[in-house]
């Protein structure tokens, strides 16, 4: 449905508040270094312009595309070349190349200061003084640090952020009320950002077909009672939503997401019995709730899959007539029967099935050729099952921190060229799979663990893509989206790696470590562990454990000392010497 003015259409659909918030997110995700005030100014200008178009859709420039309008606005920023360097060259291009250029310059790891949380009273005062600016600042700070954050979901986070301050700034103990809520929002926000980053990587690096396959599998697990045609419609609509958000078309994305939520709720009888509560909520909560809704119960007496996909004499005919539809039906049927499998496993099975049909349907006796295709699935299913079993046992034995350390060592040995901060961040996140998933019963472990690992490994892939240093990482990241985890799992110690020169400065610590939070202190120790492995990749578990135990004792001792700084200086030298001796450096 064509509109005379796209900007007027979106303004009317979304309302002024959401329109302004989404434009701010869009601008902050594109120009990540620009000051808050500059973005607010640009947003206000765009909003005023949109209002003139609402009043008269035929007014000058109102017929321009949103990319043209927003791109023109971004290109008015005076300091573009000084701040962003070659990104300024985007402004010399015409749409759609200009928008593509801006997208390519989004930075997953922008050089921005860490967000430091002010005192609760300071935050509450700021909130009461100017609530609107306070909330806009939240959107801005999150958006610029997470340039692929799912914009309509960020509106939901902002709503919860506002609710937390509204409630807690009136509480008797403001800190006790607010801080846990902010911690929860921070953790959920990081997880949400990482999940969306995988969706965008899937679309941008592997194409729409890959994303649709993922969506068919996931939605079929979630809505096993829905017909294939219904799932296909949802997949098409969901793909459009995420393509728009990942492409920077945030107004269209939010609008279409609202339409999709409306459709799902209007048709919940033919989709899922679990949607009732979600559909009673207001829009932002409703969309979030639908996205997180639990899997519906599987229909009773689902027929054997083999009948249609192995035993039938019409397999090759059906495949040849409409390959993607037939494979989509296979994936749908397999996924709705297997909520206990990870989405990536289901996609591996579908790929194996596709490869078999490609080969067998050209053979002299196709049926004879593909008759045993389901037997090929067994090792594919057992591999993640065994891996999860082993790693959950290790997690239960070690606890989260030491499990993270085991993974740090494992991954540093696999890809020692990767930067230490990236190895620490990724391995810490990989290690969280234990507390996140190992508590689940067998039937929920694999979808929890392997799909979470896909999200974390994608973080490694996008960070590595910015400054590639390892061919092995590049290979695992680019060859197959669904085989990334097995690819990394299969990597052994990199025998080609030349150990890093020893640098005493890397292992010099100061009294400031004593005032750090437990989490920050862990990161310091884990950073040292990665550096140790980079210096001595052949060090045994026992050697590394001994050094790390000594290191923990050293920090504990010096943090209790009267003259902490002297203790760190003197005992630190001894520790470095002892560690060098223990590791034979």
């Amino acid at each position: 449905d064509a509109h005379k003015s796209e900007v007027a259409h979106r303004f009317k659909d979304l309302g002024e508040e959401n329109f302004k918030a989404l434009v701010l997110i869009a601008f902050a995700q594109y120009l990540q270094q620009c000051p808050f005030e500059d973005h607010v100014k640009l947003v206000n200008e765009v909003t005023e312009f949109a209002k003139t178009c609402v009043a008269d859709e035929s007014a000058e420039n109102c017929d321009k595309s949103l990319h043209t309008l927003f791109g023109d606005k971004l290109c008015t920023v005076a300091t573009l070349r000084e701040t962003y360097g070659e990104m300024a060259d985007c402004c010399a291009k015409q749409e759609p190349e200009r928008n593509e250029c801006f997208l390519q310059h989004k930075d997953d790891n922008p050089n921005l200061p860490r967000l430091v949380r002010p005192e609760v009273d300071v935050m509450c005062t700021a909130f009461h003084d100017n609530e609107e600016t306070f909330l806009k600042k939240y959107l801005y700070e999150i958006a610029r640090r997470h340039p692929y954050f799912y914009a309509p979901e960020l509106l939901f986070f902002a709503k919860r952020y506002k609710a937390a301050f509204t409630e807690c700034c009136q509480a008797a103990d403001k800190a006790a009320c607010l801080l846990p809520k902010l911690d929860e929002l921070r953790d959920e926000g990081k997880a949400s950002s990482a999940k969306q980053r995988l969706k965008c990587a899937s679309l941008q690096k592997f194409g729409e077909r890959a994303f649709k396959a993922w969506a068919v599998a996931r939605l079929s697990q979630r809505f096993p009672k829905a017909e294939f045609a219904e799932v296909s419609k949802l997949v098409t609509d969901l793909t459009k939503v995420h393509t728009e958000c990942c492409h920077g078309d945030l107004l269209e994305c939010a609008d279409d997401r609202a339409d999709l939520a409306k459709y799902i709720c209007e048709n919940q009888d033919s989709i899922s019995s679990k949607l009732k509560e979600c559909c009673e909520k207001p829009l932002l909560e409703k969309s979030h709730c639908i996205a997180e809704v639990e899997n519906d119960e599987m229909p009773a007496d689902l027929p054997s899959l083999a009948a249609d996909f192995v035993e039938s004499k019409d397999v090759c005919k059906n495949y040849a007539e409409a390959k993607d539809v037939f494979l989509g039906m296979f994936l749908y049927e397999y996924a709705r029967r297997h909520p206990d499998y990870s989405v990536v496993l289901l996609l591996r099975l579908a790929k194996t099935y596709e490869t078999t049909l490609e080969k067998c349907c050209a053979a002299a006796d196709p049926h004879e050729c593909y008759a045993k295709v389901f037997d090929e699935f067994k090792p594919l299913v057992e591999e993640p099952q065994n891996l999860i079993k082993q790693n959950c046992e290790l997690f239960e034995q070690l606890g989260e921190y030491k499990f993270q350390n085991a993974l740090l060592v494992r991954y540093t040995k696999k890809v020692p060229q990767v930067s230490t901060p990236t190895l620490v961040e990724v391995s810490r996140n990989l290690g969280k799979v234990g507390s996140k998933c190992c508590k689940h019963p067998e039937a929920k472990r694999m979808p929890c663990a392997e799909d979470y690992l896909s999200v974390v490994l994608n973080q490694l892939c996008v960070l590595h893509e910015k400054t590639p240093v390892s061919d092995r990482v590049t290979k695992c990241c680019t060859e197959s989206l669904v085989n990334r985890r097995p690819c990394f799992s299969a990597l052994e110690v990199d025998e080609t790696y030349v150990p890093k020169e020893f640098n005493a400065e890397t292992f010099t610590f100061h009294a400031d470590i004593c005032t750090l939070s437990e989490k920050e202190r862990q990161i310091k120790k884990q950073t040292a562990l990665v550096e140790l492995v980079k210096h001595k990749p052949k060090a045994t578990k026992e050697q590394l454990k001994a050094v790390m135990d000594d290191f923990a004792a050293f920090v504990e001792k010096c943090c209790k000392a009267d003259d902490k700084e002297t203790c760190f200086a003197e005992e630190g030298k001894k520790l470095v010497a002892a560690s060098q001796a223990a590791l034979g450096l």
């Epitope: 027929p303 249609d308 035993e311 059906n318």
Partner: antibody, heavy 121, light 110 residues
Framework: EVQLVESGGGRVQPGGSLRLSCAAS????????MGWVRQAPGKGLEYIGI???????YYASWAKGRFTISRDNSKNTVYLQMNSLRAEDTATYFC???????????????WGQGTQVTVSS | IQMTQSPSSLSASVGDRVTITCQSS????????LSWYQQKPGQPPKLLIY???DLASGVPSRFSGSGSGTDFTLTISSLQPEDFATYYC???????????FGGGTKLTVL
């Protein structure tokens, strides 16, 4: 008792539509392919098409486009939607259970009693 | 695809051995996807033989089937009074869309 019962037949004008139902009892429809066969008065059996356990449909070339087979496993029922009916579609319509699940083997081992469809003005 | 049955009608007596043939214009699927049915007036057909030679459940052993590819035979070794009916063959081919019935053989009392 294991049986199939067709319903929905009757008299219809040329160009009209009719939807036949085949309700199964005593067993679950979801484990076998279900077919439709018709028999004009005093004539032989004529295969219309079949629906597999997973919902794949296969039609005789003459039936493609005018006839549609569907199934609702929750109701344990199979349907035959007939459009643009002609005088030559006058027949007894049987639903039948195939030995196979995913395709038509031509071996229908359980049949309904049939429902009469008459197309005339 | 054509399924040709012969003869189209046949008269015989109780105790006789009767043979009906069915020929397809192309090979049936797996060379054996052929079934035989018996139909009595006012009743639905009843499956007698499937996969060319396998006896359906509850069918007397006097009925037997043979053949492969395009040529098949139904034999009733010793006709009983209840066997007078119309008999049809049905073939399954490489596509489920091509399943076809023969024109029928009417077996009557001599």
């Amino acid at each position: 008792e294991v049986q199939l019962v067709e319903s929905g037949g009757g008299r219809v004008q040329p160009g009209g539509s009719l939807r036949l139902s085949c309700a199964a009892s005593g067993f679950s429809l979801s484990s076998n392919a279900m077919g439709w066969v018709r028999q004009a008065p005093g004539k032989g059996l004529e295969y219309i098409g079949i629906i597999s356990v997973g919902g794949f449909t296969y039609y005789a070339s003459w039936a493609k486009g005018r006839f549609t087979i569907s199934r609702d496993n929750s109701k344990n029922t199979v349907y035959l939607q007939m459009n643009s009916l002609r005088a030559e579609d006058t027949a007894t319509y049987f639903c039948a259970r195939d030995r196979h699940g995913g395709d038509s083997s031509g071996a229908f081992y359980l049949w309904g009693q049939g429902t009469q469809v008459t197309v005339s003005s | 695809i054509q399924m040709t049955q012969s003869p189209s009608s046949l008269s015989a007596s109780v105790g006789d051995r009767v043979t009906i043939t069915c020929q397809s214009s192309e090979s049936v699927y797996s060379n054996n996807q052929l079934s035989w049915y018996q139909q009595k007036p006012g009743q639905p057909p009843k499956l007698l033989i499937y996969d060319a030679s396998d006896l359906a459940s509850g069918v007397p052993s006097r009925f037997s089937g043979s053949g492969s590819g395009t040529d098949f035979t139904l034999t009733i070794s010793s006709l009983q009074p209840e066997d007078f009916a119309t008999y049809y063959c049905a073939g399954g081919f490489s596509s489920s869309s091509d399943t076809a019935f023969g024109g029928g053989t009417k077996l009557t009392v001599l």
